[in-house]
Interface confidence: medium
């Protein structure tokens, strides 16, 4: 039975040209995390594999940095980066857990962090 929950940074906002850290945390399970995928809609941004390390998709190499931890740093943000981001935890033996983050990239300096929320 899958007992774990994913805690994410929830709904967040950031300024155009700035950077933002996407973070997820898997808790309430002893399952082994074997890979974390970071995806934007249907596009793969990056993966962190337990044995093979990080891989950043070639199309995002200039603007995506691995970490901190299993998180992902997006740089040189544009308004087009607004949207849903997903952390997909592949675990053994539980299977797959998915967390959702919504990022809004703002033109002005009114960006503020939203509240955290959980996805079971």
């Amino acid at each position: 039975m899958m007992t774990g929950t994913i805690e994410t940074t929830g709904n967040i906002s950031a300024e155009k040209g700035g950077s933002i850290i996407l973070q997820c945390h898997l808790s309430s399970t002893t399952a082994q995390v074997t890979q974390v995928n970071w995806e934007q809609q249907d596009q793969l941004l990056a993966i962190c594999n337990a044995d093979l390390g990080w891989h950043i998709s070639p199309s995002f190499k200039d603007r995506v940095a691995p970490g901190p931890g299993l998180g992902l740093t997006l740089q040189s943000l544009t308004v087009n980066d607004t949207g849903e981001y997903f952390c997909i935890y592949h675990t053994y033996p539980d299977g797959t857990y998915t967390g959702r983050i919504f990022l809004e990239v703002l033109e002005s300096s009114v960006a503020e962090h939203g509240a955290r929320f959980q996805i079971p």
């Epitope: 074997t34 594999n49 337990a50 044995d51 093979l52 592949h90 053994y92």
Partner: antibody, heavy 126, light 112 residues
């Protein structure tokens, strides 16, 4: 450090079944995208891919040998096992196992058969 | 099956001179994800094969930069800018676009 080592009989009689074990360290077959492949090389000849087994228990076989091959894994022992039935003298070869990351699962090739075992030589003769 | 054809099959080279090996596939190795699944391996005498180059032109970890790979689609080339004695062995190209993964016949590089 990733290492793999093949073990099995040195001599097999025709029609018998060959069982080879690949014992590995430095990676896990619980890890998403990873697998172990088996490759063989008859004396003085080219390499021939035989089979792969993946972290999710998916199996791929060379169609030319599919009805003779079975691949399995014991994740807790960090082992992959290849069995080959109805052995023939033409199956005399050095058999290798190697680590592999599944193509198209985002990996660009740097982990495709990137570390090999030392190989084990199997002779089929009566 | 995808057939991999290498040439030449034998390549005598003087140390310090360049060397070139050709590999042709019977089908394009370009995947829809933009990656070309072509690797080169070197099997030194009495040893297991070792990964030299992946995805046409990327050097595997620890491989000297005198090795280089080029090509696209169905035609690929492995080059050694200056051959050294330690480069002797059999070179194989391999496709892993689809099962069964297939190797070329091998090119034996020897020192003149």
């Amino acid at each position: 450090q990733v290492t793999l080592k093949e073990s099995g009989p040195v001599l097999v009689k025709p029609t018998e079944t060959l069982t080879l074990t690949c014992t590995f360290s430095g990676f896990s077959l619980r890890t998403y995208g990873l697998g172990v492949g088996w490759i063989r090389q008859p004396p003085g000849k080219a390499l021939e891919w035989l089979a792969n087994i993946w972290w999710d228990d998916d199996e791929y076989y060379n169609p030319s040998l599919k009805n003779r091959l079975t691949i399995s894994k014991d994740t807790s022992k960090s082992q992959a096992v290849l069995t080959m039935t109805n052995m023939d003298p033409v199956d005399t070869a050095t058999y290798y196992c190697a680590r592999i990351a599944r193509p198209h699962y985002y990996w660009d090739g740097r982990y495709i058969l990137d570390v090999w075992g030392q190989g084990t030589t199997v002779t089929v003769s009566s | 099956d995808i057939v991999m054809t290498q040439s030449p099959l034998s390549l005598p080279v003087t140390p310090g001179e360049p060397a070139s090996i050709s590999c042709r596939s019977s089908k394009s190795l370009l995947h829809s994800n933009g990656i070309t699944y072509l690797s080169w391996y070197l099997q030194k005498p009495g040893q297991s094969p070792q990964l030299l180059i992946y995805q046409i032109s990327n050097l595997a970890s620890g491989v000297p930069d005198r090795f280089s790979g080029s090509g696209s689609g169905t035609d690929f080339t492995l080059k050694i800018s200056r051959v050294e004695a330690e480069d002797v062995g059999v070179y194989y190209c391999m496709q892993f676009l689809e099962v069964p993964y297939t190797f070329g016949q091998g090119t034996k590089l020897e020192i003149k």
